[in-house]
Amino acid sequence: AEDTGVDTGAPYWTRPERMDKKLLAVPAANTVRFRCPAAGNPTPSISWLKNGREFRGEHRIGGIKLRHQQWSLVMESVVPSDRGNYTCVVENKFGSIRQTYTLDVLERSPHRPILQAGLPANQTAVLGSDVEFHCKVYSDAQPHIQWLKHVEVNGSKVGPDGTPYVTVLKTAGANTTDKELEVLSLHNVTFEDAGEYTCLAGNSIGFSHHSAWLVVLPAEEELVEADEAGSV
């Protein structure tokens, strides 16, 4: 490991928000990747343990891929014997940090994503306030989540062929975590924000979706002004 002599120090996690999913349950035959992105000076080394013991490629059929630049461990076509605790150990001469992930390999039937009942919930908000819609997704395989808003085009909610007009507000991307996708935040809402919102979750089996409505009310000052203007 190289020591630049500048800001020497113990290892630290560079993307801790990407490491919050400590329990990973995946169907058999899928690919699993554990990541422990870190930094330090000198640049730390990374090693992996399975159930507290050194983990090497020869320990599993199909081997493993250690991608040191990406601080990752990849296992393809996982089987039930891959279940266990996987620990990354990141260290340099100034210190050591570690993170443990638990892998469960599922053999049950994979299904369409299941969305928690009642979410997202209908919301009523005052003009200028902030709103959050929540969507909880259960899926055997990694789901991809999108938030859609139903819109009108020339006064119509659907196209000539019956296709609903929608705008994609939020979608899975390289810099979006699962937790972030489960929440749609609307700030300083306007009357144009009122309408139907849909949480759409898909996996390799198919899609599922739940919708909710946002009603936007005038601010209280506007209500008062309207009352005064209407009084005789």
Partner: antibody, heavy 124, light 112 residues
Framework: EVQLVESGGGVVQPGRSLRLSCAAS????????MHWVRQAPGKGLEWVAV????????YYADSVKGRFTISRDNSKNTLYLQMNSLRAEDTAVYYC?????????????????WGQGTMVTVSS | DIVMTQTPLSLSVTPGQPASISCTSS???????????VYWYVQKSGQPPQLLIY???NRFSGVPDRFSGSGSRTDFTLKISRVEAEDVGVYYC?????????FGGGTKVEIK
């Protein structure tokens, strides 16, 4: 035109291997899950396997688990089915079919597009 | 696995007359999102299956309106209001809610 074209079928002896290909065109292949479905002569349809749009998730029918491997090369717009330890009961027409897309689409989320099929005969 | 059972095995229909095919699933196909994930296909001689109906009752694009799908949870029906000569083929139901995806055994529709 949206199209799927299977190839690689043929006559093979029991215990041998064969690799089927399915070339996709007319749509963004890398945004869709893909399936293999087979049909034995004079019989009904049997689902074989599915692979997610990025290849990270794969599921198989119990009848082929451990013998068949589904894979894809998104740079070549091609789906594959590697069939090992073939048995007489694997004799069938093998179809590839488009599965669920990666994002919002109106209409069915899969099995709207099928290839013409490729025949695999396992016989000694 | 979910078992899909189709009846009848075959059907001989006079042109212009209605036809009805039943399909029963061993488990409910009503999903948490309120949709029922049963699909219907027709397979004409020497061709791959063609999608007719998706999510219980939605006609796929280009499918004539004489085809309709209905049912709930575990019992499903495909109806052809007035059978035409071109409707000859084998009809299959399929559950699309979980893997392994499973098909009914098929119903052969013939013209009298």
């Amino acid at each position: 035109e949206v199209q799927l074209v299977e190839s690689g079928g043929g006559v093979v002896q029991p215990g041998r291997s064969l690799r089927l290909s399915c070339a996709a065109s007319g749509f963004t292949f890398s945004s869709y899950a893909m399936h293999w479905v087979r049909q034995a002569p004079g019989k009904g349809l049997e689902w074989v396997a599915v692979i997610s749009y990025d290849g990270s998730n794969k599921y198989y029918a119990d009848s082929v688990k451990g013998r068949f491997t589904i894979s894809r090369d998104n740079s070549k717009n091609t789906l594959y089915l590697q069939m090992n330890s073939l048995r007489a009961e694997d004799t069938a027409v093998y179809y590839c079919a488009r599965g669920a897309g990666r994002g919002y689409t109106y209409g069915p989320d899969g099995f709207d597009i099928w290839g013409q099929g490729t025949m695999v005969t396992v016989s000694s | 696995d979910i078992v899909m059972t189709q009846t009848p095995l075959s059907l001989s229909v006079t042109p212009g007359q209605p036809a009805s095919i039943s399909c029963t699933s061993s488990r409910s196909l009503l999903h948490s999102d309120g949709k029922t994930y049963v699909y219907w296909y027709v397979q004409k001689s020497g061709q791959p299956p063609q999608l007719l109906i998706y999510e219980l009752s939605n006609r796929f694009s280009g499918v004539p309106d004489r085809f309709s799908g209905s049912g709930s949870r575990t019992d499903f029906t495909l109806k052809i209001s007035r059978v035409e000569a071109e409707d000859v083929g084998v009809y299959y139901c399929m559950q699309y809610i979980e893997a392994p995806l499973t098909f009914g055994g098929g119903t052969k529709v013939e013209i009298k």
